[in-house]
Amino acid sequence: LQDPCSNCPAGTFCDNNRNQICSPCPPNSFSSAGGQRTCDICRQCKGVFRTRKECSSTSNAECDCTPGFHCLGAGCSMCEQDCKQGQELTKKGCKDCCFGTFNDQKRGICRPWTNCSLDGKSVLVNGTKERDVVCGPSPADLSPGASSVTPPAPAREPGHSPQ
């Protein structure tokens, strides 16, 4: 014998109190699959959350975060405070990056400046709280006597087009 509830489509539930007929989901609830014996309560987007997609009889509401905060977790399960560039979020709130670190985003942690010397390069542009250092040529390339002029391209025979 086929279960009579299997005929109930999404947006309805199989109502045991009414001889298992298919009843529409009550307001503020939904069923996203057929054959459900109950409807699920819609997610409420309030406070730090705001509604991105309204709940319908067949799908749950979707939330994002009120401006000033950003989503974390699957399906925006949490909202986390934004900070300014040059800051990171701590339990004491947004705090400036320590000297030698930077953050170029509104979220995440302050990261150490690149150590140019590890790659045998020199610092071309100093780092700030908001920006990483820019590494330049190696110090050897900048030593006196080292030519910084680009060598001329090898001569081509007349009549030959570049490859």
Partner: nanobody, 123 residues
Framework: QVQLVESGGGLVQPGGSLRLSCAAS?????NYWMNWVRQAPGKGLEW???????????YYVDSVKGRFTISRDNAKNSLYLQMSSLRAEDTAVYFC????????????????SGQGTTVTVSS
């Protein structure tokens, strides 16, 4: 069902005081960091203060330090914000919000908040 309900807002004159309350239900308050955040008219959401599970750690945004005090009564499943020396710029909707699982370790995300209570500071 997990729920937070704020109360205690109202109209107050500059320099005045108010005490906001937040009643928690559907979960054990003592297991979570709790926060107050606010949204001034036409502005984004701003974090105000937080308090750890047993009330031994409390932190505030610079603009309210020395004027606001966050506290909690875990036995009553309640969170409070005592606001004094109120200024026009404190006018906002105030929300209490729960720190999500792992708050202060992996993240500072808030996973539940209430509908808010409105504080208006005006003469």
């Amino acid at each position: 069902q997990v729920q937070l309900v704020e109360s205690g807002g109202g109209l107050v004159q500059p320099g005045g005081s108010l005490r906001l309350s937040c009643a928690a239900s559907g979960f054990t308050l003592s297991n979570y960091w709790m926060n107050w955040v606010r949204q001034a008219p036409g502005k984004g959401l701003e974090w105000v203060a937080n308090i750890n599970q047993d009330g031994s750690e409390r932190y505030y945004v610079d603009s309210v330090k020395g004027r606001f005090t966050i506290s909690r009564d875990n036995a009553k499943n309640s969170l409070y914000l005592q606001m004094s020396s109120l200024r026009a710029e404190d006018t906002a909707v105030y929300f209490c919000a729960r720190g999500g699982e792992g708050y202060g370790v992996d993240h500072y995300g808030l996973d539940v908040s209430g509908q808010g209570t409105t504080v208006t500071v005006s003469s």
